[in-house]
């Protein structure tokens, strides 16, 4: 039976949630960020084998036409389906605030 | 000055929309839909080079993360930014019937 | 507006394991950025800060502690939990939660809870 | 661990004049960024602690302007322009630089 979660590659080798430890140096935000110094940043990394977590049919009629022509469509890429809000400490012109971030880190991962 | 649609790669190799012709089999929906019997498949395909047409802020870290770590991060990735709705006249158990589908056909492009 | 709360046994024999659960209202607990730390105030006297969870499970710990205490983190139930065991008369203390940025800013703080170790 | 030191233990203060806390680091608390990593807090009776300045001088969301906070490296001052009635509890300063964050011992602020 089909199981969309089921990675055919092996475990953890297809489209999943990773975390990745970063400095602010890392991110190129030294210069505007002040806390946290360091950020557990949730990002969307692995395979989209054929049915893996497909987002939607786009998503499928993606995975065909790259198996029918390879060098033209590329297989579905790992993105996030959802994010989780981040709060930055950071400066402004006229000192610093706390800014919440939608768009920052990913919740959850799905193939595109 | 910073361009987020100017391709630094060279003219149309930068993630954007491109039409693919597809036949009912090249899809494997000829066992289910009827009309069209050709589909111009609007899919997004391109590099993500950086700053190039950066979805959100998680765009942005994946891509300073790719430069750091570019074994672990893959580069964003071109995906639909919104869609077309498409409709379809396809087989039914009782017959037939006209189905649109929202999320189908790319409409436009970006990189996350 | 985020609003935490502290529950547990109020009294802990000596030489057994202290048990505090956080719960966290108004507001995801899945909130990146945050960190959700423990603090106690022994009677009378000053904070001590004792550790912080990330809501990935990551954490941090005070040394002076850290051999002791194990902070957890469920966010299905949106809450996190500290557990300090081999627990003596030196700890009891008012027991806080609060939501800082990394090791600062604890904008928002439980009401406390009094955990009194007595045979 | 750094080790915070506040002075005066006790402050007896006259509503409507001013009043002045210092806190002392063992060691400097000014990052490479150019901000002080110290937090004060105040401790109304019976109340659990509520923030008052953060990265040494910024005020948090909702505290009155009569609270200030100064000093870099490792001598702050906490001030209050004009004392109310409502001013009255305990004043912690906290370092917040690195791990464990450490708190100064307090001082009690009370009407003469």
């Known amino acids: 039976a089909r199981n969309g979660d089921r990675c055919p590659l092996g475990p953890g080798r297809c489209c999943r949630l990773h975390t990745v430890h970063a400095s602010l140096e890392d991110l190129g935000w030294a210069d505007w960020v002040l806390s946290p110094r360091e950020v557990q940043v949730t990002m969307c990394i692995g395979a989209c084998p054929s049915q893996f977590r497909e987002a939607n049919m786009h998503a499928q009629i993606k995975m065909n036409l790259h198996r029918l022509k390879p060098d033209t469509v590329p297989a579905p890429c790992c993105v996030p389906a959802s994010y989780n809000p981040m709060v930055l400490i950071q400066k402004t012109d006229t000192g610093v605030s706390l800014q919440t971030y939608d768009d920052l880190l990913a919740k959850d991962c799905h193939c595109v | 000055a910073r361009n987020g649609d100017r391709c630094p790669l060279g003219p149309g190799r930068c993630c954007r929309l491109h039409t693919v012709h597809a036949s009912l089999e090249d899809l494997g929906w000829a066992d289910w839909v009827l009309s069209p019997r050709e589909v111009q498949v609007t899919m997004c395909i391109g590099a993500c080079p950086s700053q190039f047409r950066e979805a959100n802020m998680h765009a942005q870290i994946k891509m300073n993360l790719h430069r750091l770590k570019p074994d672990t991060v893959p580069a964003p990735c071109c995906v639909p930014a919104s869609y077309n709705p498409m409709v379809l006249i396809q087989k039914t158990d009782t017959g037939v019937s006209l189905q649109t589908y929202d999320d189908l056909l790319a409409k436009d492009c970006h990189c996350v | 507006q985020v609003q935490l709360q502290e529950s547990g046994p109020g009294l802990v024999k000596p030489s057994q394991t202290l048990s505090l659960t956080c719960t966290v209202s108004?507001?995801?607990?899945?909130?990146?950025?945050?960190?959700w730390t423990w603090i106690r105030q022994h009677p009378g006297k000053g904070l001590e800060w004792i550790g912080a969870?990330?809501?990935?499970?990551?954490?941090v710990y005070n040394p002076s502690l850290k051999s002791r205490v194990t902070i957890s983190v469920d966010t299905s139930k949106n809450q996190f939990s500290l557990k300090l065991s081999s627990v003596t008369a030196a700890d009891t203390a008012v027991y806080y939660c609060?939501?800082?940025?990394?090791?600062?800013?604890?904008?928002?703080w439980g009401q406390g809870t009094l955990v009194t170790v007595s045979s | 661990d750094i080790v915070m030191t506040q002075s005066p233990l006790s402050l007896p203060v006259t509503p409507g004049e001013p009043a002045s806390i210092s806190c002392r680091s063992s060691?400097?608390?000014?990052?490479?960024?150019?901000?002080?990593?110290l937090d004060w807090y105040l401790q109304k009776p019976g109340q659990s602690p509520q923030l008052l300045i953060y990265?040494?001088?910024n005020r948090a969301s909702g505290v009155p302007d009569r609270f200030s906070g100064s000093g870099s490296g490792t001598d702050f001052t906490l001030k209050i322009s004009r004392v109310e009635a409502e001013d009255v509890g305990v004043y912690y300063c906290?370092?917040?630089?690195?791990?464990?964050?450490?708190f100064g011992g307090g001082t009690k602020v009370e009407i003469k």
């Open positions: 609060a939501r800082g940025v990394e090791y600062q800013h604890f904008n928002e």
């Open positions: 108004g507001g995801s607990i899945n909130s990146g950025g945050y960190y």
């Open positions: 969870i990330y809501y990935s499970g990551s954490t």
């Open positions: 060691q400097s608390l000014l990052h490479s960024n150019g901000y002080n990593y």
């Open positions: 990265l040494g001088s």
């Open positions: 906290m370092q917040t630089l690195e791990a464990p964050p450490t």
